[in-house]
């Protein structure tokens, strides 16, 4: 018989981010003997699962196994065979599944059950699939970026390991934009967090953090677009919707049943005299911006100050990392540079949205039309959300850093999630001896 192969001196972890529009699998690696050190975990692979988000499989759950196969097989290739059985696998589902659960808890459970059965068939240490809360999504995103930026390290450095690092230990705020929700998380300056739902207390590496977080469900870029369409079709005189958020010359037919499928459009739902309508783009940034602002209710605030929809938001403080769709959209629009002012971003968005659709298609021939058509809306939405929603100003805009990766690891909630579940973020500064699990967050 064989002896159990001695594990490499490294460990691996897998996290699947089951988002509203797609699922991504991340593989992380770290030195086994340095688990409690900050900044030692890094991403070695990202695999994007082909197809939509898992919530779209509600009527075809039998296809979930095949859907996950390619990326799970990729994980088997990347991680040494001797490590497979010891490698934890976690799946976290976000706002797409939160919305499905709002519609039907039974359907959401059925999807998760099939996901769990599919993932448990692999030779890894499967630890479960669950819908994470918006608060968790915000918190883990904040942990991820600050862990990667070295903000939890007590050692002060005279050099900078990442472009955004300002040698102090002030943490970065986290701005996360998905398809179905958006999160804002940061440490406010000496400010009481007036609503308990938005308050988090952490003790990480010997330091206490009082963190504000909120997740706005239905305000991810895809659901925000559905909301805007549902709002605007209410006042359309016929089945033509002249839409400033799409390029001039762009046309698309939308089924009313698709529009009202999501819980996010319920507040705008009405009986329409047609089953379909046609979007006709007119490409006007200013009008698009105005239309988007109507999605934010700023007339009511039971606190000293709010973001929108009566949600408490403390005064913004410090630098922010804006990631996920904030980054992808701005990267496509070539607006991620630190040198581009908010005024310049607005100016460029005006020009971009005004470009004819035929011209846009020619300029970006390699991009799928479905995605390409929505960049004008998404870019405008990002500006509206950050400026009017979160109250960034032209001056504070320079404190927003659009971040895709930090030190080779994607910015997002998955790394923070794994660090927490594998007990790799000690509450106290690690000593030479490992700490008991009770001291972890």
């Amino acid at each position: 018989t064989q002896n159990k192969a001695l594990p490499e001196n490294v460990k691996y972890g897998i996290v699947l981010d089951a988002g509203s529009s797609h699922t991504s699998l991340y593989i992380y690696k770290w030195p086994a003997e340095k688990e409690n050190d900050t900044g030692v975990v890094h991403q070695v692979e990202e695999c994007r699962v082909k197809g939509p988000g898992i919530s779209k499989f509600v009527q075809k759950v039998n296809e979930i196994g095949i859907y996950l196969t390619d990326c799970m097989e990729r994980a088997r290739e990347v991680i040494p065979r001797s490590q497979h059985q010891e490698t934890p696998v976690y799946l976290g589902a976000t706002a797409g599944m939160r919305l499905l659960r709002m519609e039907s808890e039974e359907l959401a459970d059925r999807v998760l059950d099939v996901v769990e059965r599919s993932l448990s068939n692999y030779p890894f240490d499967f630890q479960g699939a669950r819908i994470i809360t918006g608060q968790e999504e915000g918190a883990y995103g904040w942990i991820t970026i600050n862990y990667l930026l070295g903000k939890f390290s007590q050692k002060t450095r005279w050099f900078s390991i990442v472009p955004y690092e300002t040698n102090n230990q002030e943490t970065f705020g986290a701005l996360d934009l998905g398809g179905a929700s958006t999160q804002v998380t940061f440490v406010p300056q000496n400010q009481t967090i007036e609503s308990p739902d938005n308050a988090l207390q952490f003790r990480l590496y010997g330091k206490d953090y009082n963190v504000y977080t909120h997740s706005f469900l239905c305000y991810g870029k895809d659901q925000a677009l559905w909301q805007k369409l549902a709002k605007d079709i209410q006042v359309a005189s016929n089945e033509i919707l002249r839409d400033p958020c799409f390029h001039p010359g762009y046309k698309k037919v939308v089924n009313v049943s698709d529009l009202y499928k999501t819980p996010c459009t319920k507040r705008f739902e009405m009986t329409l005299p047609f089953q379909q309508f046609e979007i006709q783009g007119i490409g006007n940034y200013q009008q698009c911006h105005q239309s988007i602002l109507e999605l934010f209710n700023t007339s009511y605030c039971p606190y000293s100050q709010c973001a929108f929809n009566g949600i408490f938001l403390p005064p913004l403080q410090g630098d922010f990392g804006a990631f996920s769709a904030f980054y992808f959209v701005m990267k496509f629009l070539n607006l991620t540079s630190e040198k581009v002012s908010q005024e310049k971003v607005t100016e460029m968005m005006k020009k971009f949205c005004a470009q004819p659709w035929e011209e846009i298609k020619t300029s970006y021939a390699g991009v799928k039309e479905k995605y390409l058509s929505e960049y004008c809306f998404s870019g405008t939405y990002i500006l509206s959300l950050l400026l009017q929603g979160y109250h960034f100003t032209a001056d504070s805009w320079e404190h927003i850093h659009f971040i895709g990766k930090i030190q080779g690891s994607d910015a997002g909630w998955t790394l923070g999630y794994m660090l927490n579940l594998t007990n790799m973020i000690p509450a106290e500064q690690p000593l030479s001896t490992p700490l008991s699990h009770s001291t972890y967050v």
Partner: antibody, heavy 121, light 107 residues
């Protein structure tokens, strides 16, 4: 010496139940995934199912032919693997082997001597 | 599920000859293919794992090759004790499956 010893086989009527045991020694039982494999008289080998570790919530997987009828369990404190067989059919007649892999996974480098189960009226 | 087809069903050879046993998978299983030997009245014994990895204590005349869907077990020079039934096994994905076996008999 690494050893697996099965017991509990015998003659049972169709529709009846039987519980097989497998006593493990010579290795840290709680650290290894355990399997049952069977072999009908004069036929090939058929994987019955597996049970994983406590850290995997004792997850089990089964062959389609036994799903819903057979249950694999383990008692790490007793170094023992079990196979509870209910609603037995004549086609379940076979020698049942307890197996494991002490290196990597999903192949079997340790086998018991087998225990015979006969389902007949 | 992955179906393994072994050929030939029976192979008649003499001691000293070279034996080549084949196993074909219904879909690609990389190198997750294992070989066993079983003698009458005995439990199976692992010969080769992951298509070509040898096991300590198994004579060097046994070797394995292949990847994807086609695999081969070779016994370079048959010894009298090698006449037995040989099974291949899918170790790639659940359910784990075995080939129908190749009976190696003395000519």
């Amino acid at each position: 010496e690494v050893q697996l010893v099965e017991s509990g086989g015998g003659l049972v009527k169709p529709g009846g139940s039987l519980r097989l045991s497998c006593a493990a020694s010579g290795f840290t039982f709680s650290k290894y995934w355990m399997n049952w494999v069977r072999q009908a008289p004069g036929k090939g080998l058929e994987w019955v199912g597996e049970i994983r570790l406590k850290s995997n919530k004792y997850g089990t997987h089964y062959a389609e032919s036994v799903k819903g009828r057979f249950t694999i369990s383990r008692d790490d404190s007793k170094n023992t693997l079990y196979l509870q067989m209910n609603s037995l059919k004549t086609e379940d007649t076979a020698v049942y082997y307890c197996t494991t892999q002490l290196d990597l996974y999903w192949f079997f480098d340790v086998w018991g001597q087998g225990t015979t189960v006969t389902v007949s009226s | 599920e992955i179906v393994l087809t072994q050929s030939p069903a029976t192979l008649s050879l003499s001691p000293g000859e070279r034996a080549t046993l084949s196993c074909r998978a219904s879909q690609s299983i990389s190198d997750y293919l294992h070989w066993y030997q079983q003698k009458p009245g005995q439990s199976p014994r692992l010969l080769i794992y992951y298509a070509s990895q040898s096991i300590s204590g198994i004579p060097a005349r046994f070797s394995g090759s292949g990847s994807g869907t086609d695999f081969t077990l070779t016994i370079s020079s048959l010894e009298p004790e090698d006449f037995a039934v040989y099974f291949c096994q899918n170790g790639h994905s659940l359910p784990l499956t075995f080939g129908g076996g190749t009976k190696l008999e003395i000519k």
